[in-house]
């Protein structure tokens, strides 16, 4: 906190410039209106002030607003933006995009801060929906952003949005949030012709039940192993040898490296073992030969 | 983001020292660069600044006309040239900078003895 002095003669601001840099804290709190830093906030982020000096700009600026900042402030803090306590934050309205973009930037390259979080946070919700210009921005900030998100929070991304997400942007996401992006993405891409529609439905297949896997694999997909690897496991169990062999195309060699490992290795132990037979791999594990397999229910009806 | 300064050292008064600042990992030459120094006890005060097009120069009434700030963006560098030094100039010299979207860097300092 500066003590509240009066400003020498002379030193009183009439603009944010360089020569401000010369001043001491005292001398920044004394000689600069508040209310002409509001409407010069720009001039700051060219001026090479020492965190101490934005100390007290930032103190300004808190006693002009005690309620919050004006957008037309908030969109040209640059830096002071690292300066803010998500309790500041909250206090804001915060509803063009370029804003968001603006105070992305600041950040840019680190981690997602307190800051930042709180700051989407109260974006998305004024704006009720994750729409498609939102997302297209945060994940272009943050890949991992759509991953971060509840299944919950998730179900409020309209399908039109899907169409900003990249492959990347989905890969930290568990099988409870591509349950809810998969339906979406299905129905964002669904007046997409095969290929097309498979390169673009490929990285939500985490979320796809088995009758989407068995259609696919009639349309000559050619899925690769590490896609494969992903699916539910649910999903893979009750797809045939033949089902597999043509929904991974070329790719089917990959089994044999997998076959230790989910979904692979159940999958396994539900096929025939003559059907894995016919696929030339090698795998093992599977229902040997003459054995009956019965479903519980259909032995119930028979006794 | 490290700015890194060098050139300090002990020197007699009315010799000469010639400060660099320089990034580490990324590039300045499009940062204002401030100058600053902080003697012992004292609050960290201005020295000089300059655009980041080397355009627009300022300095503290204290070091106008002996301390001179020049960048050469080829060698990503800003320099302080400091003359005529007095025992008051002795401080520890840091240089900051201001970048696109506000963007701040900040370096550790190098120390001057005028002695």
């Known amino acids: 906190e500066v003590e509240k002095t009066a400003c020498p003669s002379g030193k009183k601001a009439r603009e944010i410039d360089e020569s401000l840099i010369f001043y001491k804290k005292w001398e920044l709190e004394a000689c600069v209106d508040a209310a002409l830093l509001a409407t010069q906030m720009d001039r700051v982020n060219a001026i090479p002030f020492t965190y101490e000096q934005l100390d007290v700009l930032k103190h300004k600026l808190d006693e002009l607003y005690p309620q919050g900042y004006p957008e037309s402030v908030i969109q040209h803090l640059g830096y002071l933006f690292l300066k803010m306590s998500p309790e500041d934050i909250r206090k804001w309205n915060v509803t063009s995009l370029e804003t968001l973009k603006a105070l992305l930037e600041v950040n840019k390259g680190h981690e997602m801060s307190p800051q930042v979080a709180t700051l989407i946070d109260r974006f998305v919700k004024g704006r009720g929906q994750l729409d498609k210009d939102t997302l297209d921005t945060l994940t272009a900030f943050y890949p991992g952003y759509l991953c971060s998100l509840s299944p919950e929070e998730l179900s409020s991304v309209p399908p039109s949005s899907i169409w900003a997400v990249r492959p990347q942007d989905l890969d930290t996401c568990d099988p409870r949030q591509l349950d809810v992006l998969y339906p979406k993405a299905r129905l964002a891409f669904q007046n997409m012709n095969g290929s097309e529609y498979f390169v673009k439905i490929q990285s939500f297949l985490g979320g796809a039940p088995t009758e989407d896997l068995k259609a696919l694999s009639q349309q000559n997909v050619s899925m690769d192993l590490a896609t494969f690897m992903k699916l539910r496991t649910d999903a893979v169990l009750p797809l045939t040898v033949a089902e597999v062999q043509k929904l991974l195309g070329p790719h089917v060699e990959g089994l044999k490296a997998e076959e230790r490992h989910r979904p692979v290795r159940d999958w396994i132990l539900r096929q025939r073992q003559d059907d894995l037979d016919t696929l030339g791999l090698g795998l093992q594990g599977g229902i040997p030969n003459g054995y009956l397999v019965l479903d519980l229910s259909m032995q119930e009806a028979l006794s | 983001l490290q700015l890194v300064e060098s050139g300090g050292g002990l020197v007699q008064p009315g010799g000469s020292l010639r400060l660099s600042c320089a990034a580490s990992g990324f590039t300045l030459d499009n940062y204002a660069i401030g100058w600053f120094r902080q003697a012992p006890g004292k609050e960290r005060e201005g020295v000089s600044s300059?655009?980041?097009?080397?355009?627009?120069?300022n300095y503290a009434d204290s070091v106008k006309g002996r301390f001179t700030v020049s960048r050469d963006n080829a060698k990503h560098t800003v320099y302080l040239q400091m003359n005529s030094l007095k025992p008051e100039d002795t401080a520890v010299y840091y240089c900051?900078?201001?970048?696109?979207?506000?963007?701040?860097?900040m370096g550790q300092g190098t120390s001057v003895t005028v002695s």
């Open positions: 300059i655009s980041s097009s080397g355009g627009s120069t």
């Open positions: 900051e900078g201001v970048g696109d979207y506000g963007r701040r860097a």
